[in-house]
């Protein structure tokens, strides 16, 4: 190989050891049998080498530097040109730097030809191995702008006082062209200014200079956002961090063409704009740091460009203004990331200020719209908290627990509504009454229904789940101890037409010591499954529930067990079984950690079975299914 | 697992001769070049001589040359120093060290101490 | 032959720092330099290659950079087992290797 450099070219190549590698042996320059692993060339010099080996772009790397001066003389504007050509140099990974330094108040604008730029971020390569490298200079220090991949939308990057730009480029890219150009402009009075252009739906992914470093203290750096005036821009902060401002604050300031308050100023904590129809600025103001502890000002961001969505237009009023303690989030449902580009899904508070997820509170009356493509991409949580805190007024008080109306006119599913059902310690119970009598959900006969309610404990320290309960079923009310969550989950966009069949009447009721019990009236030729709660987990230790089953006179219920034993063994205390007939107060007991579970069993009149827990041995926990089904009576046994 | 282990050091008196030893496992130490490094007790790093065994190529810092001689025996994967003409300066902890990617690995090092 | 003038001779820091120390060589040599990292008692260990190249499992807190014939090596957070003394070295060409006088950095 020969490289001769020009004089005067103010061009330096560089061939170095590049990232270490496990192979047998090593590879040299050699130059007049001398062996190297580096050679300088500089302007005006010749020099002739040969590599000791047969692929040396295993080994070596090779840097081409090209320095600029805009100080001294006139700068040479225009495509910049790749020098020495590529077919003139080894085929070694290549890196072309061009360090252009000039006077503070000239401002210089890299501009990217087509395909333009993508920016990536730290620990991220490019498909193709070509990376374009930017930095400029505040005075003596070096600022990284970023690293860009082809095809993107960054065209034009503006700087001023200098800017340094590499290009890697593969041992194997056919590339011959740097594909940019350097243009003077007048000073820009900020550390850069990037402009993205979108020609149609797409998305970008920005960041902040120095990134994930931090942004220099009190700089100013301007992103312009070209925007189909059809397209609707958001702007949605994947990272940030705030430094330790002294002096001033940092800030995000949009400029928006058309808009009565330019320029917007949010925080960086802030929900970002959305829905913004054409052109637009964003710029990232620092601040004066604390000297002590400056910390660090960071900044990724994503753009979102898509087209307005029906919905987009439309403005729907939730009046949360009349509830007290509810609050309402509408979220992306969880999906699986598809790789191709998806439309952003926002829910937008007063058609401006967009993000992926909305909170909502109770005590005001809240306008919002949708940008997005598909609003099944969404789903709504809701939260509302039902307390007593004075016995002597709540007793006997009842709440119908109903989805207000407002909320199912939205054009998003409801996912839970969750409503937290508080009372004093001691005080008071709670008994849940449904419109239409409940199923509990088993393995044996599911629910099939569009939603049920999920009835749970609400102590924090209690895991205690009760079970899964729909309409259309026997279980006539749900009487609990003490704090619990009533969630309503829908599972079928069909909710919307059964809604009416939701209706469920909380009310405070005198204090009594079980955890639960369910009033059970079986329907005629109907199976009941009936299972303990805590299914999965186990009943808790030390914990009493009961069933009181009521039986019609003509007719005779089955009560029948699903196991022949129930499995829990005891550390401490009895786990035992009563199974009372109400009219004669007749009852048989059963030690469920030493007896067999009864055989089925015919009961003529109502009985009650109360199942109580000892405290069981982690693994051998206390799960007991059973059913009750009733006959027609055959002969009066009375 | 590359390693090198150098031995040879020891108690020497001004004006004598020791004979250090580099061997080489896990690599071929013709292929690279070989340098000897020493540290004065309390001091800091010198270079004192270099071979690249392929081209029979050696070089050494001023204040040892015509007085140490480095060498290879490819067949045994070990390098040596010849050190004559011993001075109370020469005093050190030698080690050799592998040089490709800058000195990529080193040994352990051997005492040399020059002192009558 | 090449000077490489090592600054500071010592320093003082506390985990979590930023630390850095410089190297500047007498006459250009090129990127042709390393930095190194010594414990008492034991031997040197390559940290950067080619003036700003990181050895493979040296960790990415620490970086090298050039400016002309001054170089630089940068612990961007100091850890406990940092503390250690930092050797530069030039390897250019036909020239007699050289090493810095080292820097200590010790724990404040």
């Known amino acids: 190989f020969e490289i001769a450099l020009p004089r005067e070219s103010n061009i330096t190549v560089l061939i170095k050891l590049g990232t270490p590698t496990l192979l047998a042996k090593p590879c040299y320059i050699v130059i007049s049998k001398r062996h190297i692993t580096m050679l300088s060339i500089k302007s005006g010099e010749r020099i002739v080498f040969t590599f000791s080996c047969q692929s040396p772009e295993n080994h070596f790397v090779i840097e081409i530097q090209k320095n600029i001066d805009c100080m001294s003389g006139p700068c040479p504007f225009g495509e910049v040109q790749l020098q020495p050509s590529t077919s003139l140099l080894p085929t070694l990974n290549r890196t072309f730097i061009w360090d252009v330094k000039a006077h503070k108040s000239i401002g210089l604008e890299l501009q990217f030809s087509i395909p333009r730029l993508r920016q990536i971020g730290p620990g991220e390569s490019c498909p193709d191995g070509v990376t374009h490298s930017i930095s400029g200079r505040i005075d003596a220090t070096v600022v990284r702008i970023g690293t860009f991949c082809s095809n993107g939308t960054v065209s034009r990057i503006k700087m001023q006082e200098g800017v340094k730009m590499a290009l890697h480029l593969p041992w194997f890219h056919p590339r011959n062209v740097s594909g940019f150009s350097i243009a003077n402009r007048s000073s820009i009075k900020r550390l850069c200014i990037i402009e993205s252009v979108f020609e149609g739906e797409g998305s970008a992914t920005l960041m902040s200079a120095n990134y994930p470093e931090g942004f220099p203290e009190d700089e100013l750096m301007t992103w312009q956002f070209v925007v189909p005036a059809h397209l609707r821009a958001s702007v949605s902060f994947l990272n940030f961090n705030l430094s330790n401002c002294e002096r001033k604050e940092e800030r995000v300031e949009y400029y928006i063409p058309g808009s009565t308050t330019n320029p917007e100023v949010f925080k960086l904590e802030d929900k970002q704009p959305g829905n913004m129809a054409g052109n637009f600025n964003l710029s990232l103001q620092g601040c004066d740091q604390d000297a002590q502890s400056p910390g660090i000002l960071r900044l990724q961001f994503q753009v979102l460009v898509q087209h307005p969505q029906n919905e987009s237009n439309k403005i729907y009023v939730v009046d949360l203004s009349n509830e007290r303690a509810m609050s309402l989030t509408i979220e992306p449902r969880p999906v699986k990331q598809s790789r191709k580009f998806v439309p952003g899904c926002f829910v937008c508070l007063e058609s401006r200020t967009c993000s992926s997820n909305l909170t909502l509170t109770s005590g005001s009356k809240h306008k919002i719209s949708f940008l997005c493509d598909d609003l099944t991409r969404l789903w709504m949580n809701v939260e509302k908290t039902i307390s007593c805190t004075d016995h002597r007024y709540c007793q006997r008080k009842s709440y119908s627990l109903q989805v207000p109306s407002d909320i199912l006119h939205l054009p998003v599913e409801l996912h839970d509504f969750s409503w937290k059902l508080l009372v004093p310690k001691d005080r008071l119970s709670l008994v849940l009454v449904p419109a239409q009598k409940l199923q509990q959900h088993t393995h044996e006969k599911p629910c099939n229904t569009s939603f049920s309610y999920l009835v749970a404990s609400a102590i924090p320290s209690q895991d205690l789940y009760f079970g899964s309960f729909c309409p259309g079923g026997s279980i006539k009310q749900i009487q609990v101890k003490q704090n619990i969550s009533v969630t309503l989950r829908t599972f079928a966009p069909s909710f919307q037409q059964e809604a009416s069949r939701q209706g469920l009447t909380v009310s405070f009721i005198p204090y009594f010591k079980e955890e639960g019990v369910f009033t059970v009236t079986p329907d005629t030729k109907s199976k009941v499954y009936l299972r303990t709660p805590n299914w999965d987990r186990g009943l808790p230790s030390l914990t009493s529930v009961s069933w009181n089953i009521s039986v019609p006179r003509d007719q005779v219920a089955c009560l029948t067990f699903f196991k022949e034993r129930s499995g829990v063994v005891c550390q401490t205390g009895r786990a035992f079984m009563i199974i009372q007939e109400q009219r004669t107060r007749a009852e048989e007991i059963f030690s469920l950690d030493e007896d067999v579970l009864p055989k089925p069993s015919f009961h003529h009149h109502s009985f009650w079975v109360n199942i109580s827990n000892c405290s069981p041995t982690s693994g051998k926990q206390l799960d007991l299914l059973f059913s009750v089904t009733l006959t027609p009576r055959t002969v009066d046994l009375t | 697992e590359v390693q090198l282990v150098e031995s040879g050091g020891g108690l020497v008196q001004p004006g004598g001769s020791l004979r250090l030893s580099c061997a080489a496992s896990g690599f071929n130490l013709s292929y690279y070049y070989i340098h000897w490094v020493r540290q004065a007790p309390g001091k800091g790093l010198e270079w004192v001589a270099s071979i690249y065994s392929s081209s029979s190529y050696t070089s050494y810092a001023d204040s040892v040359k015509g007085r140490f001689t480095i060498s290879a025996d490819t067949s045994k994967n070990t390098a040596y120093l010849q050190m004559n003409s011993l001075r109370a300066e020469d005093t050190a902890v030698y080690y050799c060290?592998?040089?490709?990617?800058?000195?990529?690995?080193w040994g352990q090092g051997t005492l040399v101490t020059v002192s009558s | 032959d090449i000077q490489m003038t090592q600054s500071p001779s010592s320093l003082s820091a506390s985990v979590g720092d930023r630390v850095t120390i410089t190297c500047r060589a007498s006459?250009?040599?090129?990127?042709?330099v390393a930095w190194y990292q010594q414990k008492p008692g034991k031997a040197p260990k390559l940290l950067i290659y080619?003036?700003?190249s990181l050895y493979s499992g040296v960790p990415s807190r620490f970086s090298g950079s050039r400016s002309g014939t001054d170089f630089t090596l940068t612990i961007s957070s100091l850890q406990p087992e940092d503390f250690a003394t930092y050797y530069c070295q030039q390897s250019y060409y036909y020239y007699p290797i050289t090493f810095g006088q080292g820097t200590k950095v010790e724990i404040k």
């Open positions: 006459q250009s040599v090129s990127s042709a």
């Open positions: 080619s003036a700003s």
């Open positions: 060290a592998r040089a490709y990617y800058g000195f990529d690995y």
